[in-house]
Amino acid sequence: MASMTGWKIHYTSTAQPCPYPMAPPNGHLSPVQAKYILKDSFSIFCEPGYELLQGHLPLKSFAAVCQKDGSWDQPMPSCSIVDCGPPDDLPSGRVEYITGPEVTTYKAVIQYSCEETFYTMKVNDGKYVCEADGFWTSSKGERSPPVCEPVCGLSARTTGGRIYGGQKAKPGDFPWQVLILGGSTAAGALLYDNWVLTAAHAIYEQKHDASSLDIRLGALKRLSPHYTQAWAEAVFIHEGYTHDAGFDNDIALIKLNNKVVINSNITPICLPRKEAESFMRTDDIGTASGWGLTQRGLLARNLMYVDIPIVDHQKCTAAYEKPPYSGGSVTANMLCAGLESGGKDSCRGDSGGALVFLDNETQRWFVGGIVSWGSMNCGEAGQYGVYTKVINYIPWIKNIISNFGGGGSGGGGSAKFVAAWTLKAAAHHHHHH
């Protein structure tokens, strides 16, 4: 029987290779092969300071695969020099291009600086470099721009430490002075460029209607049309303050809805340093300013100030333990100032204003006290003005300012009130200043 032999066919196929890829300038290709056929792939990597782009669009990685029709499934990207783009603007400052005009590419250098006199740079030295990751970065590694913080405690006033009272203030003497209207007349002191420090009792009645507070800065005459208007975004009354039951913790903060522009007539007061108590000892001179009642019993038209000495705490406590002031209302959170002979004092309408002291080391003024309360008859002999002792509240102040933000939002919406409340029976043995 004859054997049948069939055809033996061997199929061989050569996959159509893809065009040989050429790495883009400032990039390299991997893996390098003699040829690339079906399912072979390559990746492109850029040199440091260059980034993968398809047109304007960034890519983190790139790989192309050879398809069966002999074409690559992706077009070749480019390796473009990293461009950090225009640096962020610096409020109250400026930016200078060091490498060259408008040069914002890899390794370019810029220098931020703050407006002289009234602002100082926080965080770093202001020098930033465009790094390979595309971010402007400081020598400390920060990606966000520095901050121009207002210089505090500048005053046109030169003090010789003499005690004299009831003086008219001149422009720039008390640039932190804030006039608060909306209920009764009260005062406050500017902190940074969007906070006002005041007394809790001065704004307590407006606590749920903070947006009604008419806040004026840069004013010298109480009724003058020349002032900078500000409005409250939020009010923070110390949670330990109880209205009409003594004046412990008589402190509040108002957050303004916009930052104010700092100039010679509007400058914040400094908060006390740890060492500040050495400038607030008994007989050290502080200065209180305001538009409160004068000796004639009327609200002052012009901003007035009085230089008064710190009074020994025990002496002050004793003065308010005598009838008709008995009740021991002077606490460790208060300080007293005034003359034993009387005649120089803060008074109604001065409430919330700052009692300021000169820091002899920094030559800047700082807030040591907040006008709080005193005897029914201002400037009474043997009685003293009582002030909230600000140094006891530095953690409280800093906590609120850090938690509730530096910059005013400038947005709409109603002003907020933040605090904890427990009302006690009213006590009337002394008056609000």
Epitope: G55, H56, L57, L59, S61
Partner: antibody, heavy 114, light 107 residues
Framework: DVQLQESGPGLVKPSQSLSLTCTVT?????????WNWIRQFPGNKLEWMGY???????SYNPSLKSRISITRNTSTNQFFLQLNSVTTEDTATYFC???????WGQGTTLTVSS | DIVMTQSQKFMSTSVGDRVSVTCKAS??????VAWFQQKPGQSPKPLIY???YRYSGVPDRFTGSGSGTDFTLTISNVQSEDLAEYFC?????????FGAGTKLELN
């Protein structure tokens, strides 16, 4: 599968701020690509607003630069659009998209009206 | 800004026809052009990127061509589901810009 979903208020008053969220599923926004906001006005004109890249860098349309901010939350895999001081001219359908443009959200319609 | 001009706002076609939608850039954009299809009430659907690369899942009757300033989207053998608005888009230069769109309608 990669999916993008926009969410927002629908109605905003003039001068207020608009905030929109794009929630991405099926792909990490830090892995690659640029994550964009694009809007389409009545009449179908499309406008690219800006993007935030996988690295967190942003790029904005200069016509909006003073009003726009694009941010992200990498832990929730979301990116956000904030547009300040809106006017009736900002009435549009807002889309988020992954670029290369291969994935788009369904869009959210925003009306600016008092 | 680069202007992407789609000179024809409307184009009429019939099922089975071949139609070409054109787009002209005001300056060189290389091959960094994409095409999108949009139907009423829907988001734009990506068709073509880098002038001539089809996105996955896009039927091969859609082809893109051109580079520099002149770009074309060609639909061979038009289907009824292709009746939509088509946008070109450049992503070569900041800011990214779109054409005004060309609506494909039935004859």
């Amino acid at each position: 599968d990669v999916q993008l979903q926009e969410s927002g208020p629908g109605l905003v008053k003039p001068s207020q701020s608009l905030s929109l969220t794009c929630t991405v599923t099926g792909y990490s926004i830090t892995s690659d690509y640029a994550w964009n906001w694009i809007r389409q006005f009545p009449g179908n004109k499309l406008e690219w607003m800006g993007y935030i890249s996988y690295s967190g860098r942003t790029s904005y349309n200069p016509s909006l630069k003073s009003r726009i901010s694009i941010t992200r939350n990498t832990s929730t895999n979301q990116f956000f659009l904030q547009l300040n001081s809106v006017t009736t001219e900002d009435t549009a359908t807002y889309f988020c998209a992954r670029y290369w443009g291969d994935y788009w959200g369904q869009g959210t319609t925003l009306t600016v009206s008092s | 800004d680069i202007v992407m001009t789609q000179s024809q706002k409307f184009m009429s076609t019939s099922v089975g026809d071949r139609v070409s939608v054109t787009c002209k850039a005001s300056q060189n954009v290389g091959s960094n052009v994409a095409w999108f299809q949009q139907k009423p009430g829907q988001s734009p659907k990506p068709l073509i990127y880098s002038a001539s690369y089809r996105y996955s899942g896009v039927p091969d009757r859609f082809t893109g061509s051109g580079s520099g300033t002149d770009f074309t989207l060609t639909i061979s053998n038009v289907q009824s589901e292709d009746l939509a608005e088509y946008f070109c888009h450049q992503y070569n230069t900041y800011p990214l810009t779109f054409g005004a769109g060309t609506k494909l309608e039935l004859n």
